[in-house]
Amino acid sequence: HSFGPGPGLGTPRSPCNARGPCRLFFRVCLKPGVSQEATESLCALGAALSTSVPVYTEHPGESAAALPLPDGLVRVPFRDAWPGTFSLVIETWREQLGEHAGGPAWNLLARVVGRRRLAAGGPWARDVQRTGTWELHFSYRARCEPPAVGAACARLCRSRSAPSRCGPGLRPCTPFPDECEAPSVCRPGCSPEHGYCEEPDECRCLEGWTGPLCTVPVSTSSCLNSRVPGPASTGCLLPGPGPCDGNPCANGGSCSETSGSFECACPRGFYGLRCEVSGVTCADGPCFNGGLCVGGEDPDSAYVCHCPPGFQGSNCEKRVDRCSLQPCQNGGLCLDLGHALRCRCRAGFAGPRCEHDLDDCAGRACANGGTCVEGGGSRRCSCALGFGGRDCRERADPCASRPCAHGGRCYAHFSGLVCACAPGYMGVRCEFAVRPDGADAVPAAPRGLRQADPQRFLAGVIAVIVVVVIAIVAGIVVLVISRKKRMAKYEKAEIKEMGEMHRELNA
């Protein structure tokens, strides 16, 4: 295990920059391995900082190939079950000691990031990573803290006072709620929170706790800032001061607690564990996710990251959930592809943000004095006399449909039509027969269908009804087809878009 200049890189580089003695720290960060961008999330699985670091003093002419490393292990308590696939981020930090303005200076020397697959309980895995001119040799493994066991560190239950369907004092097993824990009779008084037993009358302590009944906190815990590890599924408990107490973030950074450690959200131009570093140059590539680094031409000038769409944070390290702003209107489904935002629109809506309603009259103009009518999930134009077509743009011959009954003659007029009725008929459409005996006019039955033949008359009425129904159905079909044609172009575009989305989401 070593950290130093890689082979074949010429004169070995000192980590101390010829500015007196320095110390190296390692920050280990675990992130869920399911994300495409390993840098987009906080250290959700856990983070830790190496301790007991020896001081390295540069001597003229001395090789920097083997630098003194922190003693022992860097332990990272993790939350919940072990995921198996994860992203491992190891940052090598230099703390410059000695007399200069501002006290100790921190600089990021190297950052290695890699996605790993590792079962808990397995042997140490060895790795070598190069970044820039530095080379880091390290080993890593995942180990369950009792009572968690197995490749995923699933928790075996212990006797806890929690109501359950199981027997007295027993609780359902996580993550198997249908099973109950096996009762184990620990030493009387053994802490139910910090102790456990695998054999009767014993009291084994979780890390960070000691004493015969596991009630005494250990002063040096694997959790940072005196935080105490809890069971494997709960990370670190909070009996002592929290990691953010006193705000360890410098230069206006804001502190957030993660897995018993802390993370600083740094203001523009600052970087590092505590936002204390502005000595990273743009050539070091401090901006994640392709962000543009501005300024930072030398270690003494601050840099600023200009983030790509969908990312934010002082180093573009956080993915923005742009869908939380609900940009898709009218119930559209939002998909954030990172580099682009897509809206999948509900039927009847279209546009980049589903802002166009295909079924309303808002964007629909009926020409020549026609009026738009909504209904039945569609819209149509009710045209003024003398006009027809979908948008009332076509000139219509009002007499084309032969509206005058019983041989009446139709005359087109600027405001519509006029029927000149044949002798014996009257009405706007010549629909009434005039009785010769001076009785009231009655609707005329078609010739051949007189009262003397009621069956034929009834059949005629039914035929007329059928024709009317067919006409209505035909009208609806025409409306549906025209609407489908209108939506087809949007759907084609959406299908292509969804194909692109599928490719992008799988990339």
């Epitope: 970044t131 820039g132 200009h306 592809l337 580099h339």
Partner: antibody
Framework: EVQLVESGGGLVKPGGSLRLSCAAS????????MNWVRQAPGKGLEWVGQ??????????HYAESVKGRFTISREDSKNTVYLQMNSLKTEDTAVYYC????????WGQGTTVTVSS | NIVLTQSPATLSLSPGERATLSCKAS??????VSWFQQKPGQSPRLLIY???NRYTGIPARFSGSGSGTDFTLTISSLEPEDFAVYYC?????????FGGGTKVEIK
Amino acid sequence: EVQLVESGGGLVKPGGSLRLSCAASGITFSNFWMNWVRQAPGKGLEWVGQIRLKSDDYATHYAESVKGRFTISREDSKNTVYLQMNSLKTEDTAVYYCTTGYYFDYWGQGTTVTVSS
Amino acid sequence: NIVLTQSPATLSLSPGERATLSCKASENVGTYVSWFQQKPGQSPRLLIYGASNRYTGIPARFSGSGSGTDFTLTISSLEPEDFAVYYCGQFYSFPSTFGGGTKVEIK
């Protein structure tokens, strides 16, 4: 000083192959997304493709015009990114630049690829 | 893909004059627009990012403005070294696309 140096350009027949290299110095190469951008003679700039970091499983993205024919790879240990060009067409004739990041901040000097029979 | 249209194609001006270059996007790109300068035989150089921010080392005579679909690059007083081709590029939507360029030539 940041330097990106492209190489591997030349004359090739339609249907042929060529591999371009871009060697970086002065930057922590493994922390940078890398792109290829081309410029046909007398024409504007066209993005060709991109490769991201090891932490992103070296994810690649390509322009529709080259998808299936061009492949981008990188070797962080050598600070080098490559563009493998197969089934070349006359319309692929251009100066090819490598450039960094999402916003194309650092650029190389370019290498000329001529596809002609 | 988003289409960027630059105008004019050529701008003939004298040193000391003010140059105004236009770039129109086919759809809203927010402020994710950059401007690049390219001199004959050289590679492009980033001038402006985020529509209005000068990149490191770029002189103050270069300024950018605009948002949405209309963007402008202004060179307040042309220097002899400013005569070149200028490209706008959008970085709002993947893939990034460029305009056809505006050539600023000496009158």
